[in-house]
Interface confidence: medium
């Protein structure tokens, strides 16, 4: 149980001390005080680093001293022969003799008190950010106007997050900008476009002033600018290292600045906008887009007509054509959808004729009706070639979709008669 | 056929055999036969049969036999109530559509139409090709295909002949330009039997092909001049007979 | 940047059999018709092979059918061209070619010599 | 099949002038299907023209298509050096066989 004060005395004190002993003594203040340690009796057989009998006064790991000997006080006014002073609230004191004492030796008496330490200026860290406030037991960190104090409640920051930036049009600079920024904060800014808009960032080199990168290239204070996985930065330095515009593909963007304690610059400033979310020109083979632009954007639309001997399959309907809007996640909606080719189905068979099984029966694909020879022959012309025409039909050039027409050949007889001379 | 050689089908592959009555006719087209009028006026559901060199009944079980739909006698034969003493053959000509389409092939294919030009017009001496399974001079009638090969003759030739058995007057019988009259040659002729079949002449802008200049139809005496209808006076009714009765498939 | 590279040509004699392959990258290799033209030492272009983009359907020269098996395996974004029974007249430049709008043949390959030659 | 027939087969000319190239089909062939390839020496062909009039990426203005039905024509308003080579017509609409014409040869003067 911690105690504002104490005495210490070795054993038989003020009897001579028995040989081997070691005895220890575990004194602790209560929190936010230090201890005062002094000792007014000194007698412990002298050696070398007393290394025969001592009394030992540790802090933690550290030693703090280790005595041995007679002392007397060097102040006619005070019977301290020997203090310690620790700013720390616990405090360990150990005794030793060895196994002989040539004389007879009395050891010693000590005092501690709890004594209050000036965190603010006893420690190399500075505890606090900004102000630093010293009390009796403790100490509180205080902050300069326009400054809060962060949850550790040491740090002072600026207020600088929460903003969210909704317009499509906008301009967002850091805290006092041009002035220098804050130090010691984390700035937050939100930008929540409409789906279908993606934010575009913009710079100018001129307006980006932040503290540079250490020697390993990590900087110190940085600019990260974050759309869904995709991130940007972090970016330091004098001009703005990153791309003038930053074509975020998505509407929503996080930025995010981050300073230290020390080097405040001017800071940053940045316009940005909502661009309709483009959509690429994508792969359709055989057809036109209509309308033809070199950029497609958020909510445009595009029929999408397939070439002559080409159709849009969609369930058991061909179509020529069909439409495409860019959606707001950057795709062409209907973006299975394909012109294939219009295929004629398997060609009609004729009466005293053929068709040889066609290769394909795709559009451009070419058959050929052919009628029995020698017994037939093709009646109304065209040659019997056909080809897949853009309509799904199998043509001819001269008779169009109407199927060729086999007729007997007439007049010809197989062998010749002659005449039998009698 | 009187003074003919044997011939086989596929000399004339359009020659169709009627077996009642005993007759000819030639095959146009896969839906139409042409013949003579006198061979179908009294029978209008004729037996027929094509692919075949031979009438023999057994070559006729395995050869082609072709059904009547209907028969077309042209309207200008004068139909008689006693056939048998007709003296008046002019129109000798009618058609048979059939129910099934005929298949074609070495031994069954059609013989052409005369066209309506000039060319077609016979000059004496033309010589046309005949065939049937007619009186010979042997039989009354030839199990196997006979074929000969005749000139052209003026009408008068035919006038000029005694009528063998005349049934009237010889100048009952009655001659017209719808006749053609051919013959006279060693003794080569058509007889009964034969009537219907084709008088084939030669294609005068295709030489490969014959066409049907003729039908055998009737004649004062066997072995001398024989008279035959001359298609080509008909070859508009006929063509308007075959399209107002095709099915549309046809068309 | 759309790219074809074809592989496996080579010397064989007559009668014998190579199979040349077309490596597509840079474009959807299923969305297109692809197709396989020759060109004989110091002459014109001859189309070989079409192969529509899902593979159902090939069309070939009529000097080759029977002979030569147009295929695609689009997991592998590649086109094959197995050619057996070759003759001397085979003796070309094979080259692998994209067909886009009206099947015009966009994207080449560098081409890959066959020589057939006892 | 359609025969596309290319004259001249050789054309020889000098840059400045103007060319003119003829592609003509055996039968009809619908304009969509009708191409033109440029090839250079020891390279492979390139696109150069499709569906008969439009141009190919990267492909200069002063070249131009035109055409229908069986005749066709690639013209070069004004030749420059580069543009010596051979050019070679394509259908692809009436299949198999796609064909390609023969080839015009264009040479400087």
């Known amino acids: 149980e911690p105690t504002m004060y104490g005495e210490i005395l070795s054993p038989n004190y003020p009897q001579a001390y028995p040989s081997e002993v070691e005895k220890s003594w575990d004194i602790e203040v209560p929190e936010g005080y230090g201890i005062h340690l002094y000792f007014t009796h000194l007698d412990i057989e002298l050696s070398e680093n007393c290394a025969y009998d001592s009394v030992q006064i540790i802090s933690g790991d550290t030693e703090e001293g280790r005595l041995c000997g007679q002392r007397s006080s060097n102040n006619p006014h005070s019977p301290i022969v020997e203090e310690f002073q620790v700013p720390y609230n616990k405090l360990q004191v150990i005794f030793k003799s060895d196994f002989s004492n040539e004389e007879r030796f009395t050891g010693f008496a000590a005092y501690y008190v709890a004594t209050d330490i000036n965190e603010c200026t006893d420690f190399v860290d500075v505890p606090c950010s900004h102000f630093c406030n010293n009390f009796i037991g403790g100490y509180f960190c205080s902050c300069p106007p326009e400054y809060f104090l962060h949850d550790d409640m040491k740090n002072c920051g600026v207020n600088c997050s929460g903003d969210v930036f909704t317009a499509l049009i906008g301009e967002i600079a850091s805290p006092n900008y041009p002035k220098p920024y804050p130090e010691n904060s984390r700035c937050e800014y939100q930008i929540r476009l409409e789906k279908g808009f993606q934010v575009v960032v913009t710079l100018r080199r001129e307006d980006f002033d932040v503290e540079a990168a250490d020697s390993a290239g990590n900087c110190l204070d940085s600019l990260v600018f974050v759309a869904g996985d995709r991130q940007f930065g972090p970016y330091c330095g004098h001009g703005f290292p990153g791309p003038l515009n930053i074509e975020t593909k998505s509407n929503a963007l996080d930025i995010i600045f981050q300073t230290d304690l020390t080097g405040q610059k001017k800071g940053w400033k940045l316009r940005y906008h909502g661009d309709p979310m483009p959509c690429p020109k994508e792969d359709t083979p055989n057809s036109v887009w209509e309308p033809a632009k070199a950029k497609y954007v958020f909510r445009d639309v595009v029929q999408i007509t397939c070439l002559d001997g080409f159709e849009v399959v969609e369930g058991r309907v061909g179509a020529t054509s069909f439409y495409s809007t860019c959606q707001s996640n950057g795709k062409w909606s209907n973006s299975k959808l394909k012109c294939q080719p219009v295929d004629c189905g398997i060609p009609e068979s004729i009466e005293n004729g053929k068709v040889e099984d066609p290769e394909s029966t795709l559009f451009g694909s070419v058959i050929r009706y052919t009628c029995e020879e020698p017994y037939y022959y093709m009646e109304n012309g065209g040659g019997g070639e056909y080809h897949c025409a853009g309509n799904g039909s199998w043509v001819n050039e001269v008779l169009g979709p109407e199927l060729p027409k086999c007729v007997p050949v007439c007049g010809v007889p197989r062998e010749p008669f002659e005449e039998k001379q009698r | 056929i009187i003074g003919g050689s044997d011939a086989d089908i596929k000399n004339f592959p359009w020659q169709v055999f009627f077996d009642n009555p005993w007759a000819g006719g030639a095959l146009i087209n896969e839906y139409w036969v042409l013949t003579a009028a006198h061979v179908v006026e009294g029978n209008r559901e004729p037996t027929m049969y094509v692919g075949s060199t031979s009438v023999q009944t057994s070559r006729l079980a395995k050869s082609k036999m072709l059904t009547p739909e209907h028969v077309f006698i042209h309207p200008g034969w004068k139909l008689l109530e006693v056939p048998e003493g007709r003296t008046n053959f002019d129109n000798d000509i009618a058609l048979v559509r059939l129910k099934d389409p005929v298949k074609m092939g070495p031994t069954v294919s059609p013989i052409c139409l005369p066209g309506t030009s000039s060319d077609y017009n016979l000059m004496d001496g033309d010589l046309g090709l005949i065939s049937g399974w007619g009186r010979t001079e042997k039989r009354d009638r030839a199990v196997r295909l006979k074929a000969a090969r005749l000139p052209v003759a003026p009408l008068r030739k035919c006038k000029e002949v005694k009528v063998e058995k005349p049934t009237a007057d010889a100048e009952a019988y009655v001659f017209t330009p719808n006749m053609i009259c051919a013959g006279g040659e060693k003794g080569m002729d058509s007889c009964k039997g034969d009537s219907g079949g084709a008088f084939a002449v030669q294609d005068p802008n295709d030489k490969t092909k014959f066409y049907a200049a003729g039908l055998v139809s009737w004649g004062p005496q066997c072995g001398t001049y024989g008279l035959y209808t001359r298609v080509k006076n008909y070859v508009d009714w006929i063509m308007k007979t075959m399209q107002e009765n095709s099915t549309p498939r046809e068309d | 940047e759309v790219m074809l590279v074809e592989s496996g040509g080579g010397l064989v004699k007559p009668g014998g059999s190579l199979r040349l392959s077309c490596a597509a990258s840079?474009?959807?290799?299923?969305?297109?018709?692809m197709s396989w033209v020759r060109q004989a030492p110091g002459k014109g272009l001859e189309w070989v092979a079409t192969i529509s983009s899902g593979g159902s359907h090939t069309y070939y020269l009529d000097s080759v059918k029977g002979r030569f098996t147009i295929s695609r395996d689009n997991s592998k974004d590649t086109l094959y061209l197995q050619m057996n029974s070759l003759r001397a007249e085979d003796t070309a430049l094979y080259y692998c070619?994209?067909?886009?709008?009206?099947?015009?043949?966009?994207?080449w390959g560098q081409g890959t010599l066959v020589t057939v030659s006892s | 099949q359609i025969v596309l027939t290319q004259s001249p087969a050789t054309l020889s000319l000098s840059p400045g002038e103007r060319a003119t190239l003829s592609c003509t089909a055996s039968?009809?062939?619908?304009?969509?299907?009708l191409h033109w390839y440029q090839q250079k020496p020891g390279k492979a062909p390139k696109l150069w023209i499709y569906s008969t009039s439009n141009l190919a990426s990267g492909v200069p203005s002063r070249f131009s298509g035109s055409g229908s039905g069986t005749d066709y024509t690639l013209t070069i308003s004004s030749l420059q050096p580069e543009d010596f080579a051979t050019y070679y017509c394509h259908q692809y609409y009436r299949h198999p066989p796609i064909t390609f014409g023969q080839g015009t040869k264009l040479e400087i003067k």
């Open positions: 070619a994209r067909l886009f709008t009206g099947y015009a043949m966009d994207y």
């Open positions: 039968s009809s062939v619908s304009s969509s299907y």
């Open positions: 840079g474009f959807t290799f299923s969305n297109y018709a």
